[in-house]
């Protein structure tokens, strides 16, 4: 369960892949599409509001006690829209929604390395946001083998802290 309904902190950042492609968001036919693309040098990177929430790890009920906290994030590229996991379609979509946000909008944050993060579905442990065919998709990761899989690694370039955009 998420410890508090308010985020413990928020940041505004641009999101790029391990290979430095940008994650961009485009309004098309009244819905948003998510793209993974090389940006032209003069083009500004799209920004995402990351809200960080604390959550007790499920295993904390069986031995980890109060220390078993995870950081979960929600990602909002524009007001009232959030990235959400569609586990049936193995896709990542942008949906307009009101708070409280659905579980599909929460992702467990992993620092894979000093400057790379991964986003694990709260609703489907072991499934991460990843890059497939120039789009974001949900990718199942075998913990024992593919912890460093480049297609689930992202770079966050934080811009500044922010109340809302």
């Amino acid at each position: 369960s998420i410890t508090g309904i308010s985020p413990i902190t928020e940041s505004l950042a641009s999101l790029s892949t391990y290979n430095d492609q940008s994650i961009t968001f485009a309004l098309e036919d009244e819905s948003y599409e998510i793209y993974v693309e090389d940006l032209k040098k003069d083009k500004k990177k799209d920004k995402v509001l990351l809200s960080y929430y604390e959550s007790q790890h499920p295993s904390s009920e069986s031995g980890d006690g109060v220390d078993g906290k995870m950081l979960m994030v929600t990602l909002s590229p524009t007001k009232d829209f959030w990235l959400q996991a569609n586990n049936k379609e193995h896709s990542v979509e942008l949906h307009k929604c009101e708070k409280p946000l659905p579980d599909q909008a929460f992702f467990v944050l992993h620092n894979r390395s000093f400057n790379c993060v991964s986003f694990e579905c709260k609703t489907d442990p072991g499934v991460f946001i990843g890059v497939k065919d120039n789009h974001l998709a949900l990718i199942k990761v075998d913990y024992s083998e593919n912890l460093g899989s480049e297609n689930i690694l992202f770079k966050l370039s934080e811009i500044h802290h922010h109340h809302h955009h």
Epitope: S59, K69, M70, V108, F114, H161
Partner: antibody, heavy 121, light 106 residues
Framework: EVQLVESGGGLVQPGGSLRLSCAAS????????MYWVRQAPGKGLEWVAS????????YYPDSVKGRFTISRDNAKNSLYLQMNSLRAEDTAVYYC??????????????WGQGTLVTVSS | DIQMTQSPSSLSASVGDRVTITCKAS??????LDWYQQKPGKAPKLLIY???NLQTGVPSRFSGSGSGTDFTLTISSLQPEDFATYYC????????FGGGTKVEIK
């Protein structure tokens, strides 16, 4: 209850080597970033090394880079610090610390009591 | 590398006083800053994380604020058990501690 117990400290001559260990218990060791932090006598805290949960990446400040190596054995719930080419300025209490959250490199939520390393001839 | 400059390096205060310690980062660290308390002969203890979040069990007289490069730890009413050394710590880009502030009895 989270516990971190350091061992392996002692007196060593300049140029010598030492291996510190940290035995972890009370939490899922393999899910956390781990750290070594040191404190020279009467001085402040200095971050010495960091390692990712799966030991895929490790990090050091310039002051110890190339001389110190952090490692971990998740099967044994143990963290290590191999210290080579020791200098007098490495004399300090060495603390093992655990990340505050599962999977992330933010904050040092739990600390051991430390082990003293003295480098002197 | 990011440098963290803490001030003052020491201060004398009385029980009941309001105490403020500041930490300045050499570049923007957003809100990736903690405060730790250390008593003589003991390991440091996490007090505040992500600039303003109190660690479980830490009294509410402790508070943190700031963003970017300038941060503050405030103890609203100093208690006898608060006499200790306090360190800021950034984890936005690498990991760096401030030099520490020793809070002594006046």
């Amino acid at each position: 209850e989270v516990q971190l117990v350091e061992s392996g400290g002692g007196l060593v001559q300049p140029g010598g080597s030492l291996r510190l260990s940290c035995a972890a218990s009370g939490f899922t060791f393999s899910s956390y970033w781990m750290y070594w932090v040191r404190q020279a006598p009467g001085k402040g805290l200095e971050w010495v090394a960091s390692i990712t949960p799966n030991a895929g990446e490790d990090y050091y400040p310039d002051s110890v880079k190339g001389r110190f190596t952090i490692s971990r054995d998740n099967a044994k719930n143990s963290l290590y610090l191999q210290m080579n080419s020791l200098r007098a300025e490495d004399t300090a209490v060495y603390y093992c610390a655990r990340g505050h959250y599962y999977y992330t490199s933010y904050s040092l939520g739990y600390w051991g009591q430390g082990t003293l390393v003295t480098v002197s001839s | 590398d990011i440098q963290m400059t803490q001030s003052p390096s020491s201060l004398s205060a009385s029980v009941g006083d309001r105490v403020t310690i500041t930490c300045k980062a050499s570049q923007n660290i957003n809100k990736h800053l903690d405060w730790y308390q250390q008593k003589p002969g003991k390991a440091p203890k996490l007090l505040i994380y992500f600039t303003n979040n109190l660690q479980t069990g830490v009294p509410s007289r402790f508070s943190g604020s700031g963003s970017g490069t300038d941060f503050t730890l405030t103890i609203s009413s100093l208690q006898p058990e608060d006499f200790a050394t306090y360190y800021c710590f950034q984890y936005n880009n690498g990991w760096t501690f401030g030099g520490g502030t020793k809070v002594e009895i006046k």
